[in-house]
Interface confidence: low
Amino acid sequence: LNTTILTPNGNEDTTADFFLTTMPTDSLSVSTLPLPEVQCFVFNVEYMNCTWNSSSEPQPTNLTLHYWYKNSDNDKVQKCSHYLFSEEITSGCQLQKKEIHLYQTFVVQLQDPREPRRQATQMLKLQNLVIPWAPENLTLHKLSESQLELNWNNRFLNHCLEHLVQYRTDWDHSWTEQSVDYRHKFSLPSVDGQKRYTFRVRSRFNPLCGSAQHWSEWSHPIHWGSNTSKENPFLFALEA
C-alpha cells in the first residue's frame, strides 16, 4: 500500500509508505493497523520536534523513530536519541541543530518495536516546516508629524522571513493587517495624535528560503500615543 498524505503544513508532495504484512482475510492483526502520522516542525532552526498522536494506538505503545536524509551525505539511518513522552509513552522525538539539514529530503520512519513489520515512512521538506521565534525589540519612531515607523528584530538573517504587522487604535473593533517583506520595517503614513495605537508583528519562513505556512507567535505588543480617551465609544460598549 503506497499512500500520498496531504497535510496543511506545506508538504503536499510528501509521500508516506505504509509497509503492512499480508493477512488472511478472516483475521485482523495489529500489524494491519495504520501508524499515526508524524508531524515535524523546525523551531528557528535551533531544534526540531517530530510528534505523533500516541493516544491513537489501541494500547499504550512505545513507538520508535528513525530518520535519515535521502540522496545526501547524511543518508545513514539514525535512531532518535531524545524522545518526547506523553503519559510515559513515546509521542515524539527532538532533534538538535546539528542534526537538521534544511535543504535535503528528510525521511522519518515510525515503527512498532513489538511488530517490526508495522512501520510507516514519510518524506518531508524541512525548509517548509520552519517556525521562527516571535519578532523582538519592537521600536517606534516618528518620521514626521503624522507618520510612524515600526522596526523589529528577528533571530535570523532577515531575507528568509516575511512578516505580518497588525495595528489598531483603542477605538477599533478589529486589527488592520499589512504584509511586509524581508526589510522588517513598516510605516504608518497617517497617525491620529488623539488615539492610542497598538502594534504587533509575526514572521514566517517564506518565500526566499522556504515555503513555510506556519507563522511565528505574535510579538509582544508595542503602544504609541495618548492614553485611552474617556470618550472612546468602543470602550463604553465593552463596559456596558
Epitope: 551525505d73 537538521i100 535570523f156 538573517l157
Partner: nanobody, 120 residues
Framework: QVQLQESGGGLVQPGGSLRLSCAAS????????MSWVRQAPGKGREWIAS???????FYADSVKGRFTISRDNAKNTLYLQLNSLKAEDTAMYYC??????????????RGQGTQVTVSS
Amino acid sequence: QVQLQESGGGLVQPGGSLRLSCAASGFTFSSAHMSWVRQAPGKGREWIASIYSGGGTFYADSVKGRFTISRDNAKNTLYLQLNSLKAEDTAMYYCATNRLHYYSDDDSLRGQGTQVTVSS
C-alpha cells in the same frame, strides 16, 4: 568538516570593483545553497546575496544592480563580483553554506572572511 575560505578582498577606491572568491570543501557544494554576508565594524551581520543549488539568485536592496553572486560547481567555488563600490560597502565579507546560512548566531558554517575597504 565544512571549510570555507574567502579571498579577493582589499583596498579599493569609490566606484571601483573587486571579485571575491570562496573555496568550499567538506560538503556537497553543488547541492548547497550559498550566501555572502558582511559585517561592518560595530554593526550587525548583513545578508548580501544568495545563490541556490538550482542557480536562483537573491540580493539585498543595498547591493542590487551592483553586486553579482555566481558559482562554479566544478571548482567548488562561490564568487561575488562587487562593482560601483561605495564607502558604506566597507566590511568583512563572509561566505556561508546552506544549513544555517541565515541563522545569525551560528558561526560554524561560514569562513574567516575577507576584508573589503572602500576609501579614497
